[in-house]
């Protein structure tokens, strides 16, 4: 004969556990049904009656199977420096992430609590480490032979162009200026061509550093010994 299926609520076997999507109610001392995502427990179980679930109200949610008496409140609306990447529904919280040109200075479980504008490296400084979703740009002074003439959160120090004859030497914030040596062009003595490099710049270009952390939001779900908490161990 097949084993009889127990319907909730039921007393677990001594030392046994409740099944998937059930929880052990310590007051009733029974295995009782959890409520599905988007719902919460309106009435807890008794020894003879199972959990009664109800839908989450507007602007509240439950993401996991649970027996919380109240749904969680969705986070406040995204601020002007953020974009809403996930709307508030009965089954998921609103997620706000930082808009382009900003990074997350203070993260929360999902999304970002506080965004800050990415640092801009001023002329004479280039990006040593690009900004990521959760870290700011790191600037460094341009080393001899390199320059940056922009205020930018993305530009790195670039090598000076190499001239046959240098009109104006490069420095950390300005490229070298080459003097024209072509006899075929008629121009006033000392005239400057901007620019007229001899060699291509590509062989001198520094590789762009890889981001220190891969972009992409990481989602953390609560786990652990807080049975009814909406982060109770899920299905």
């Amino acid at each position: 004969l097949p084993a009889q299926v127990a319907f909730t609520p039921y007393a677990p076997e001594p030392g046994g556990t409740c099944r998937l999507r059930e929880y052990y109610d310590q007051t009733a001392q029974m295995c009782c049904s959890k409520c599905p995502p988007g719902q919460h427990a309106k009435v807890f179980c008794t020894k003879t009656s199972d959990t009664v679930c109800d839908s989450c109200e507007d602007s509240t949610y439950t993401q996991l199977w649970n027996w919380v008496p109240e749904c969680l409140s969705c986070g406040s609306r995204c601020s002007s420096d953020q974009v809403e990447t996930q709307a508030c529904t009965r089954e998921q919280n609103r997620i706000c992430t930082c808009r382009p040109g900003w990074y997350c200075a203070l993260s929360k479980q999902e999304g970002c609590r506080l965004c800050a504008q990415l640092r801009k490296c001023r002329p004479g400084f280039g990006v040593a480490r690009p900004g990521t979703e959760t870290s700011d740009v790191v600037c460094k002074p341009c080393a001899p032979g390199t320059f940056s003439n922009t205020t930018s959160s993305t530009d790195i120090c670039r090598p000076h162009q190499i001239c046959h004859v240098v009109a104006i030497p490069g420095n950390a914030s300005m490229d070298a200026v080459c003097t024209s040596t072509s006899p075929t062009r008629s121009m006033a003595p000392g005239a400057v061509h901007l620019p007229q490099p001899v060699s291509t710049r590509s062989q001198h270009t520094q590789p762009t550093p890889a981001p220190s952390t891969a972009p992409g939001t990481s989602f953390l779900l609560p786990v652990g010994p807080s049975p009814p908490a909406e982060g109770s161990t899920g299905d």
Epitope: Q26, T27, A28, A41, K42, V43, F44, T46, K47, T48, S49, V52, P69, E70, P225, S226, P227, P228, A229
Partner: antibody
Amino acid sequence: QVTLKESGPTLVKPTQTLTLTCTFSGFSLSTLGMGVGWIRQPPGKALEWLAHIWWDADKYYNPALKSRLTITKDTSKNQVVLTMTNMDPVDTATYYCARMTGTRYFDVWGQGTTVTVSS
Amino acid sequence: DIQMTQSPSSLSASVGDRVTITCKASQNINKFIAWYQQKPGKVPKLLIHYTSTLQPGVPSRFSGSGSGSDYTLTISSLQPEDVATYYCLQYGVLWTFGGGTKVEIK
């Protein structure tokens, strides 16, 4: 409006049985999720939960007093009755009944009735 | 049985002071805690349930917090009408009240 009112003897002798009745209005014990519990408070002391009964007749008792307590309900009369046997002077207290929500906390209380145990 | 240890047992504070009352459960009660106010000679009145949910009509100066086995009731700015004894109630496993905290005005 939800109201609860306790009634019963104000004086009982040691070893006697106390019978208290809670009569309520504004809700029904046939409604899913409704419950009524009893709590007492000795003079100048803290509250102590005694017993509870749900709409489906499921009952819970304070383990320390379980052998002395019985709780019953009469849904048609909107009443819950608590009996406590073998009364002792230390059981002198104000006895309250209170409504319990489906998520298990007491939200509305009766005015209380004072019971003195003395010979 | 779960024991609830409430502290302090009494306190005296000035009007406008921030007052904090704590309850420690003997085990995790998963936020199933309520707070009651009992004025002298009166019936207990529910202030907060499920750790932090304020009952309708309760002034916003009352707030609750906590998780696991440690819980707090805070009165952000004590008023003369807050003179009372405050009790916590755990309802995670059966029901147990704390010993009470008597709040007086200096």
